[in-house]
């Protein structure tokens, strides 16, 4: 009876996500058979989050809207480990929008999910950010410095990275 009600709850939770994500990939978390964490297929997972590389080229605002429709946001990078995971899935000759912007042009950088901007956990390329007109952040590869962030004009279409919390069922 307990297992039956747990299954019913899982099915109803899965139905919630079905409109955005018709297929989920789930793994058992820890030793308890009751705890499953899922990411939409073909998103990748790292720690408690799911990531999707969007290869369509869109402006920053449209990229954020695109992530939002999928129940996600443009990526917020909180640690070096997280960035190291993300870059494994990126192409060196492409640039990808992050969920980081400075809409007022006053160098008050802000993350889309309101995570406080911490200067100590940023990965700007050397000399960046360098232009008050360039109010959105990308991650790209420079041969001299590997992967890092750069500020660019928000309306210039780029690829992007979406991030959402794992779905627990």
């Amino acid at each position: 009876n307990f297992m039956y009600s747990k299954t019913v709850k899982r099915l109803s939770k899965l139905r919630e996500y079905q409109q955005y994500h018709p297929s989920l990939t789930c793994v058992m978390e820890g030793k308890d058979i009751e705890d499953w964490s899922c990411c939409p297929t073909p998103w990748t997972s790292f720690q408690s989050s799911c990531y999707f590389i969007s290869t369509g080229m869109q402006s920053w605002t449209k990229s954020q809207k695109n992530c939002s429709v999928m129940g996600a946001d443009l990526v917020v990078i909180n640690t070096r480990e997280e960035q190291d995971f993300i870059i494994q899935n990126l192409k060196r000759n492409s640039s990808y929008f992050l969920g980081l912007s400075d809409p007022g042009g006053r160098r008050h950088w802000q993350w889309v999910d309101q995570t406080p901007y911490n200067e100590n956990v940023t990965f700007w390329h050397s000399g960046e950010p360098n232009n008050l007109d360039e109010r959105c952040a990308i991650i790209n590869f420079r041969s001299s410095e590997e992967w890092g962030w750069n500020d660019i004009h928000c309306h210039v279409p780029q690829k992007s990275i979406c991030k959402m919390k794992k779905i627990y069922i």
Partner: antibody, heavy 121, light 111 residues
Framework: EVQLLESGGGLVQPGGSLRLSCAAS????????MSWVRQAPGKRLEWVAT????????YYPDSVKGRFTISRDNSKNTLYLQMNSLRAEDTAVYYC??????????????WGQGTTVTVSS | DIVLTQSPDSLAVSLGERATINCKAS??????????VNWYQQKPGQPPKLLIY???NLESGIPDRFSGSGSGTDFTLTISSLQAEDVAVYYC?????????FGGGTKVEIK
């Protein structure tokens, strides 16, 4: 008073090249992102190129990508547009304009008087 | 590309009367409460001149008979009381996403 003065337009044969210049005064040129916009006879305005203040980022629409190159010399307060492989459809008045950000978008706030480019055999 | 469709193509209005120009975008140009549409005025033989930015913000030095409104995909430029010096072609432009695009223009004349 802001002044933008374009020059370098003229008559050129298809496949030929032309270099336009835009001399700026009345602004701190080196802090401005700059753009070129063109207007073919009887047609709507068309954005052609943008360059950021430091000159390290440039942007173009597909219609001119690979043929046109925007550049700048901040020491001379001058913006350039190198146009190669010119076609009849590039015939237009070419304007340079200053770019002003507005949150995630922008406006083109000061415009030059324009220089005419005619591509014809 | 975002296509901007202006209507009407031309407009004849009596001096002192209201002129209304519409601009429809092929997709939304809004984000976070702002609309990325600008309006320009172009008189014969002159470059365009910025009138309105962000759909409804009046550019410095522009008379307040000009106003802009709208959001999403539908935008309007209004001249509340047409003056002789307002005879021109008016263009809308979007800056939400490259390539920046302009409407086809609306010619305003005096009736």
């Amino acid at each position: 008073e802001v002044q933008l003065l374009e020059s370098g337009g003229g008559l050129v044969q298809p496949g030929g090249s032309l270099r336009l210049s835009c001399a700026a005064s009345g602004i701190t040129f080196s802090t401005y992102t700059m753009s070129w916009v063109r207007q073919a006879p009887g047609k709507r305005l068309e954005w052609v190129a943008t360059i950021n203040s430091g000159g390290d980022n440039t942007y173009y629409p597909d219609s001119v990508k690979g043929r046109f190159t925007i550049s700048r010399d901040n020491s001379k307060n001058t913006l350039y547009l190198q146009m190669n492989s010119l076609r009849a459809e590039d015939t237009a008045v070419y304007y340079c304009a200053t770019y002003r950000p507005y949150y995630y978008g922008s406006v083109l706030d000061y415009w030059g008087q324009g220089t005419t480019v005619t591509v014809s055999s | 590309d975002i296509v901007l469709t202006q209507s009407p193509d031309s407009l004849a209005v009596s001096l002192g009367e209201r002129a209304t120009i519409n601009c429809k975008a092929s997709q939304s140009v809004d984000y976070d409460g702002n609309s990325y549409v600008n309006w320009y005025q172009q008189k014969p033989g002159q470059p365009p001149k910025l009138l309105i930015y962000g759909a409804s913000n009046l550019e410095s030095g522009i008379p307040d008979r000009f106003s802009g409104s709208g959001s999403g995909t539908d935008f309007t430029l209004t001249i509340s009381s047409l003056q002789a010096e307002d005879v021109a072609v008016y263009y809308c432009q979007q800056s939400d996403e490259d390539p920046w695009t302009f409407g086809g223009g609306t010619k305003v004349e005096i009736k």
